[in-house]
């Protein structure tokens, strides 16, 4: 009789994760009698994948009916393939015995698993950064195979170049992960901006996965302050306004100081949004000029998003106004949070709202 051959016709097989893999094996002779076993890997540490004679292998089925007479086809089908199934599979013929004796191995079939990358997750800085500063965004995707992958960053559709990307592990593995960091320069116009991490892989059939992050979560746009005096009213009261413009986020506290003493503190809330996503706020203070002998120094102090306070001062000239008798009020604070302040914004910005 001619020598038995164990034939594994495919050197390699590539399968998408979740699919079934067929590993082909035929023998050239019914002689000698004895079982076929399938192993992953070679040598003493090899892993038994299927043994026709005995054992429970729920994911593995014989392609041909093993009880069929003259059967020389010992191909197997492994269901629900995962990246962990990657490796080289050997079809091994044994001679019947007590125990069965290994006789001959096929050349092996390398199973590679095409696994899709997970949806990219983009994370920004833990704390907000002020506009005109640079912040880092990271993008992570896991579980893909093969290792080749392309990752691109975009800001408002424009590709970013200050990017550092790593694919791990460096050596052979059943699956891989990618981590990329992009450095993004924030501008005052970036409240509505978005960064996109785009991942392209052979398993995605040209339809890349995208992860996004809104710069609104990362940016702080500090306010501009302007304090102005309206014309004197007939009752000797001067209306002083503090215009706080183009800030983000909304978290802002405004304090009026008269000659260094706190007159009123207000918190911004439910402000309408400008087109660019920033906010404006106008607060006013009525100063009774006739109650003062000397000029009054008014200070509008703004604390924005937990940052150090910013001040803008304005002097109301008392000497220019005749003193009215019988008044003992230094400054009249008619404003509550609602009545004492008015929302200032351009008409252009009226109907634009910002969503987080």
């Amino acid at each position: 009789e001619e020598e038995l051959q164990v034939i594994q016709p495919e050197k390699s097989v590539s399968v998408a994760a979740g699919d079934s893999a067929t590993l082909n094996c035929t023998v050239s002779s019914l002689i000698p009698v004895g079982p076929i076993q399938w192993f992953r890997g070679a040598g003493p540490g090899r892993e038994l994948i299927y043994n026709l004679k005995e054992g429970h292998f729920p994911r593995v089925t014989a392609v041909s009916d093993p009880t069929k007479r003259n059967n020389m086809d010992f191909s197997i089908r492994i269901s629900n393939i995962t990246p962990a199934d990657a490796g080289t599979y050997y079809c091994v013929k044994f001679r019947k015995g007590s125990p069965d004796v290994e006789l001959k191995s096929g050349a092996g079939t390398e199973l590679s698993v095409r696994a899709k990358p997970s949806a990219p997750v983009v994370s920004g800085p833990a704390v907000r950064a002020t506009a005109e500063h640079t912040v880092s965004f990271t993008c992570e995707s896991h579980g893909f195979s093969p290792r080749d992958i392309t990752l691109k960053w975009f800001k408002n559709g424009n590709e970013l170049s200050d990017v550092q990307t790593n694919v791990d592990p460096a050596g052979k593995s059943v699956s891989y992960s990618i981590r990329s960091t992009a450095r993004v320069l924030l501008t005052r116009r970036d409240v509505h901006s978005q960064v996109i991490c785009e991942v392209a892989h052979v398993t995605l059939q040209g339809d890349p996965l995208r992860g996004t992050a809104n710069l609104s979560e990362a940016i702080r746009v500090p306010p501009f302050l302007e304090v102005t005096q309206q014309s004197m009213r007939a009752d000797n009261q001067v209306n002083v306004t503090c215009q706080v413009t183009k800030f983000y986020p909304q978290r802002l506290q405004l304090t009026w100081l008269e000659n260094g003493n706190v007159s009123r503190t207000e918190m911004a809330s439910a402000l309408p949004e400008n087109k660019d996503g920033t906010y404006n706020w106008t607060s006013w203070l009525l100063v009774n000029v006739s109650a003062h002998r000397d000029d009054v120094k008014l200070t509008c102090q703004v604390e924005h998003d937990g940052q150090p306070a910013v001040n803008k001062s304005f002097s109301v000239k008392v000497s220019a106004h005749p003193k009215e008798q019988g008044s003992n009020t230094a400054a009249e604070n008619t404003g509550t949070n609602e009545r004492g302040s008015s929302d200032y914004k351009d008409d252009d910005d009226k109907h634009h709202h910002h969503h987080h």
């Epitope: 019914l30 009698v33 005995e54 054992g55 009916d65 093993p66 009880t67 007479r69 059967n71 019947k96």
Partner: antibody
Framework: QVQLVQSGAEVKKPGASVKVSCKAS????????INWVRQAPGQGLEWIAM????????HYNQIFKDRATLTTDTSTSTAYMELRSLRSDDTAVYYC????????????WGRGTLVTVSS | DIVLTQSPDSLAVSLGERATINCRAS??????????IFWYQQKPGQPPKLLIY???NRDSGVPDRFSGSGSGTDFTLTISSLQAEDVAVYYC????????FGQGTKLEIK
Amino acid sequence: QVQLVQSGAEVKKPGASVKVSCKASGYTFTNYWINWVRQAPGQGLEWIAMIDPSDSETHYNQIFKDRATLTTDTSTSTAYMELRSLRSDDTAVYYCAMDYGSLYAMDYWGRGTLVTVSS
Amino acid sequence: DIVLTQSPDSLAVSLGERATINCRASQSVRSSGYNWIFWYQQKPGQPPKLLIYLASNRDSGVPDRFSGSGSGTDFTLTISSLQAEDVAVYYCQHSRELPTFGQGTKLEIK
């Protein structure tokens, strides 16, 4: 280690039925044919039938086609052979045997079950 | 149906001598490049034991003094040097179609 353990001896009256069991161990029961063979006292071997436990496909010797029924219980890895309308010449040792090479041969044998048919 | 006829029915051979048992099929048992003949040994009070499969292949654990030969319709089991423990009845079986056995050959020591 492949083992086939058969049920104990039976004494039956003519016209009765007998059901012999064969419990398999040491291998995957559904992957190999089970044959039944009998041997009358001082006589040769006579093949009765075979069954594939995976799908209960059976092949019978024409002589026994109308009187023998093979079944299996895969949950207990047990094969059964029932012989009906017993006659005195059915007195024999009944063997189960496993076909390890799918060659329609008998590689591993049970110890046999003696069935005596006597009035 | 294929009928197998063994010869002789019984045989006495001296220890250390060659024993030869023949099996003739009523039609060829060759198919798919194989001769579908098997040889069994049965000792008193024991089940049969497979010796040779597909005409010429010793089963595992079978001493190499046992050999099988033949093709088509005529087959031979040979014991090259008879040992005391070889006393038994020997059966041929075919599986070209559904199995049948030869009538058996009783081997004794002369």
